[in-house]
Interface confidence: low
């Protein structure tokens, strides 16, 4: 599974990536008053999403950069060829202790699959904690818990999502590795669907406990950006989304699920070579605080206010967005202090705990993702062998409707 | 008709070698992959390779690895079982197997004998 | 590994009877889970692929449901010729395993 690292080229100095389009969908005064989304926000939000690129730090040593995206959940730094670090970020999987150790039997041998894992561990992804996550053939790691038609279009960690299709050689697998503090998955001696004689692909990506992800690369035969996106999207790095319900005009008890990005990080994906690694490090985020004096006074990048209803510190804008509006928490954060809710008893106020925003129809359609990548509509699918019940026994323990049926 | 049929079954003496054959008809064997399953005297059943439609990506289990060899010829529609360094544990019925819904044996040999013993 | 364990290892029943036999999984399978028939001196037979979706040719009398580490294969009424080894097999990661095998016989 792990070759011994080849000479890699020297990454050289002047050299970096770039963090796009970071703040998706949102303008400055909707992060600042987060209420409920009007239509003519909703119309806003589609066209908020080109981003921006972000300045670049250069480090002293010239070969790594370090970005910063603007909205501060992750410093992100890249590894050249050269730079030792990016051989100590790449998890040897052979070596590990066997019994923790997984050939994924159906993604090793499949073109354009998805298979749900769960991990050992509490994964905490721009501050939510995960249990479980969906691997795909074609490089990335699905993160959220509602399964959908567009697996790539966000909620994702993709150390090189592109069409790879492990089917195609006997020597492709796809490996994950879980210790209790770190869950590798290893896409190993893979093949892009149609570019077979570009040679195979071998890197990971690594979620460790504490929130750091690191994407290793140890060989990548082809300049990705020649890579094509005409079949498959291909993106390196992050984004996370929330989801709204809204209620359909055609049928009036039932709700729409709209997917909202509100935040993604690009890498550039000419620095993604062979042995070289990038490393995302978690900063601070407003749920972390657990209580209002902790929330008000932090001193991040967000906006964080306190909700009482829901004991929640939040900027409005995670993935529990939906309990946020429901709740009024943004009105009722509006000019308030910590002393304001000292006097109100909020465990009558408080919401069933059963209570889950993902409640109602899970028909989503293109029309209602608010996403860049609607031009590829990708038909991974979440399991290659789904019965009668399609998709029913993929979904979070606590989603409940109907699946969107991937087909298979 | 779908059919797979074993056979190179027989008695052989601990530490030599055996190679079991699998002959497929009625569907077209190079897009399958195919497995061997086996099943000691009033056992249960365990599983012992697999090898996928192309050849050469083959898995073991555990108590076989690099004892066994698992092969394939798609011009002949035959599946190989080579057994080297036999052990009076290996004694069981070898089944040949077609793997197929997300790996699951959908079709099954009739199965062939296998005795270790001195 | 993963294990498989199945229960009961055996169980007597009588004909028109409603028969569930589970099957644990040691770690999350998600729904690569099967279940196979087998009579005594015959290959075993594919039921059930993927937790809960029946195999072509076999009768509807049997049912399959779960996901994660809990399954169940159910008869809903018992034929004569159901008397049988039932097993199951993860087929989530290698190396392949199945369930020891529950015995259903005649009371």
């Known amino acids: 599974l792990s070759p011994q690292p080849g000479a890699g080229h020297d990454e050289g100095p002047g050299s970096g990536w770039a963090a796009k389009g970071t703040v998706r969908g949102w303008n400055r005064r909707a992060r600042e008053s987060p209420g409920h989304v009007s239509e003519p926000d909703r119309t806003q939000l589609s066209q908020d999403l080109g981003g921006g690129t972000l300045a670049m730090d250069t480090l002293p040593d010239n070969r790594t950069r370090v970005v910063e995206d603007n909205h501060s959940y992750y410093v992100s730094r890249l590894y050249g060829p050269s730079e030792p670090h990016s051989r100590e970020l790449w998890v040897d999987v052979a070596e590990a202790n066997r019994s923790q150790v997984k050939i994924h039997t159906i993604l090793s041998n499949t073109h354009r699959q998805a298979s749900r894992v769960v991990l050992s561990f509490d994964f905490p992804f721009y501050g939510h904690p995960l249990r479980q996550i969906t691997i795909a053939t074609g490089g990335f790691i699905f993160m959220g818990d509602v399964i959908h038609r567009m697996l790539t279009a966000t909620q994702y960690v993709a150390p090189l999502m592109a069409n790879f299709n492990p089917g195609y050689s006997d020597n492709s697998t796809v490996v994950y590795f879980d210790n209790g503090t770190v869950f590798v998955v290893q896409w190993d001696h893979v093949y892009l669907q149609g570019w077979e004689d570009k040679g195979s692909f071998t890197f990971q990506a690594a979620l460790h406990h504490d929130g750091r992800i690191v994407f290793a690369y140890k060989e990548i035969p082809m300049s990705v950006p020649e890579i094509s996106s005409s079949q498959h999207p291909v993106k390196t790095g992050l984004s996370d989304a929330f989801m709204i319900l809204n209620p359909s005009p055609d049928v009036p008890e039932s709700r729409r699920r709209s997917i909202f990005e509100y935040h993604r990080i690009e890498l550039d994906p000419s620095k993604v070579t062979s042995m070289s690694a990038v490393e995302f490090t978690p900063l601070p985020t407003c749920l972390q605080h657990r209580s209002c004096d902790a929330c008000m006074s932090s001193d991040l990048t967000f906006n964080c206010s306190w909700c009482h209803v829901l004991q929640r510190c939040s900027s409005g804008f995670d993935r529990y967005r939906q309990e946020w509006m429901d709740y009024g928490c943004a009105q009722e954060a509006e000019g308030r202090m910590c002393e304001d809710f000292q006097d109100e008893d909020h465990d009558s106020a408080s919401p069933d705990t059963s209570f889950s925003p993902y409640d109602g129809d899970l028909t989503t359609t293109s029309s209602s993702l608010f996403i860049d990548s609607l031009t590829t509509e990708d038909d991974t699918k979440l399991n290659p062998y789904a019965g009668g019940d399609g998709l029913q026994n993929n979904l979070s323990p606590k989603t409940k409707g109907t699946p969107v049926h991937l087909g298979t | 008709e779908v059919q797979l049929l074993e056979s190179g079954g027989g008695l052989v003496q601990p530490g030599g070698s055996l190679r079991l054959s699998c002959a497929a008809s009625?569907?077209?064997?190079?897009?399958?992959?195919m497995s061997w399953v086996r099943q000691a005297p009033g056992k249960g059943l365990e599983w012992v390779s697999a090898i996928y439609g192309a050849g050469g990506k083959t898995y073991y289990a555990d108590s076989v690895k690099g004892r066994f060899t698992i092969s394939r010829d798609n011009s002949k529609n035959t599946l190989y079982l080579q057994m080297n360094s036999l052990r009076a544990e290996d004694t069981a019925v070898y089944y040949c197997?077609?793997?197929?819904?997300?790996?699951?044996?959908?079709?099954w040999g009739q199965g062939t004998l296998v005795t270790v013993s001195s | 590994d993963i294990q498989m364990t199945q229960s009961p290892s055996s169980l007597s029943a009588s004909v028109g009877d409603r028969v569930t036999i589970t099957c644990r999984a040691s770690q999350d399978i998600s729904n690569y889970l099967n279940w196979y028939q087998q009579k005594p001196g015959k290959a075993p037979k594919l039921l059930i692929y993927?937790?809960?979706s029946l195999q072509s040719g076999v009768p509807s009398r049997f049912s399959g449901s779960g996901s994660g580490t809990d399954f169940t294969l159910t008869i809903s009424s018992l034929q004569p010729e159901d008397f049988a080894t039932y097993y199951c097999?993860?087929?989530?990661?290698?190396?392949?395993?199945f369930g020891q095998g529950t015995k259903v016989e005649i009371k």
């Open positions: 097999q993860q087929s989530y990661t290698y190396p392949l395993t």
């Open positions: 009625g569907f077209t064997f190079s897009s399958y992959a």
């Open positions: 197997a077609r793997i197929s819904h997300g790996w699951g044996f959908d079709v």
């Open positions: 993927a937790a809960s």
